[in-house]
Interface confidence: low
């Protein structure tokens, strides 16, 4: 079983998963879909990487520049590294400042 | 109903610069949901993605072309714009504007094409 | 760069007949692959997207199937109109970097 057919017999299942099970689906070539991402436990998108984000997305990733104002998007890239963001060329705007040193991300999310 | 429309310079000297613009009406080209791209295709031959932008001004190119290329996105004339410099014969193509939905890399709507040559 | 083989290159078929054209990708494109229709002096025009999905206003005579690297296009009734040259284009790469099949071209019997 290829990764987009495992990823549609998993994809009801999704909305409550995993940071760990977020993390290895990225290793699948899966490319799941906005609307599934959408629909995603904000704590277990949180801890995801620009990369782990990117290859979990796949093509579809152009999508966040859509969506960067709603949750949980929103508040994925206010944890990311701005240098990190840019990297995908789409223009998402609001992470991290470049140079910033990261003391607690924690503290982050209760400011925004 | 969605337009298309390429326009530009038929004929570049080789070394020279390739500048095409399209023209989008009766849609926005402001909308979130679409990028807007570039394809050519040489006479006889197939279809080859030059690069696609957002109405953010944020721009993809092919790797190929990546050293040659600037596309551009002028909202308030609902126009964006290709450059490509350095051109030689092999540049001489069919170039269609196209519309790309941001969730996919399909192009769904077309600009009919304008052909531009490279000739000295 | 993902390199997406069409065959064969010409495709002749009667009216009314049957037509399956074949696109291979060098590797797994998952579902990411569009069809599209050129007639002499126009432009493409999308045909199928996601592998398997009409795009509006296109007859339910045309179907495509497949997944990963093997992809097929059926035309189950050949009209007059339907004689054209089809691409593939695959989209599943980032950055973007979108290929096309070469292309078959569909002539008359």
């Known amino acids: 079983m290829n990764g987009s057919e495992y990823f549609v017999k998993i994809q009801s299942f999704l909305g409550g998963a995993p940071t760990e099970d977020l993390k290895a689906l990225s290793q699948q070539n899966v490319s799941m879909d906005l609307a599934t991402f959408m629909k995603l436990r904000t704590d277990a998108v949180l801890p995801l990487t620009v990369a782990e984000v990117q290859k979990l997305l796949g093509p579809h990733v152009e999508g966040l520049k859509a969506e960067e104002r709603h949750r949980p998007v929103r508040d994925w890239i206010l944890r990311q590294r701005q240098d990190d963001l840019d990297t995908l060329g789409l223009g998402l705007q609001g992470g991290i400042p470049n140079g910033y040193l990261v003391l607690d991300l924690s503290m982050q999310e209760a400011l925004s | 109903q969605l337009q298309l429309q390429e326009s530009g310079p038929g004929l570049v000297k080789p070394s020279e610069t390739l500048s095409l613009t399209c023209t989008v009406s009766g849609g926005s080209i402001s909308s979130s949901s679409y990028y807007w791209g570039w394809i050519r295709q040489p006479p006889g031959k197939g279809l080859e993605w030059i690069g696609s932008?957002?109405?953010?001004?944020?721009?993809f190119y092919s790797p190929s072309l990546k050293s040659r290329l600037n596309i551009s996105v002028d909202t308030s004339k609902k126009q964006f714009s290709l450059k490509l410099s350095s051109v030689t014969a092999a540049d001489t193509a069919v170039y269609y504007c196209?519309?790309?939905?941001?969730?996919?890399?399909?192009?769904?709507?077309w600009g009919q094409g304008t052909l531009v040559t490279v000739s000295s | 760069e993902i390199v997406m083989t069409q065959s064969p290159a010409t495709l002749s078929v009667s009216p009314g007949e049957r037509a399956t054209l074949s696109c291979r990708a060098s590797?797994?494109?998952?579902?990411?692959l569009a069809w599209y229709l050129q007639k002499p002096g126009q432009a493409p025009r999308l045909l199928i997207y996601g592998t398997s999905t009409r795009a509006t206003g296109i007859p339910a005579r045309f179907s495509g199937s497949g997944s990963g690297t093997e992809f097929t296009l059926t035309i189950s009734s050949l009209q007059s109109e339907d004689f054209a040259v089809y691409y593939c284009?695959?989209?599943?790469?980032?950055?973007?970097?979108?290929?096309f099949g070469q292309g078959t071209k569909l002539e008359i019997k």
């Open positions: 590797q797994s494109v998952s579902s990411n």
């Open positions: 932008v957002y109405y953010s001004g944020s721009a």
């Open positions: 284009q695959q989209y599943n790469t980032w950055p973007p970097e979108y290929t």
């Open positions: 196209a519309r790309r939905p941001y969730k996919s890399g399909l192009f769904d709507f």
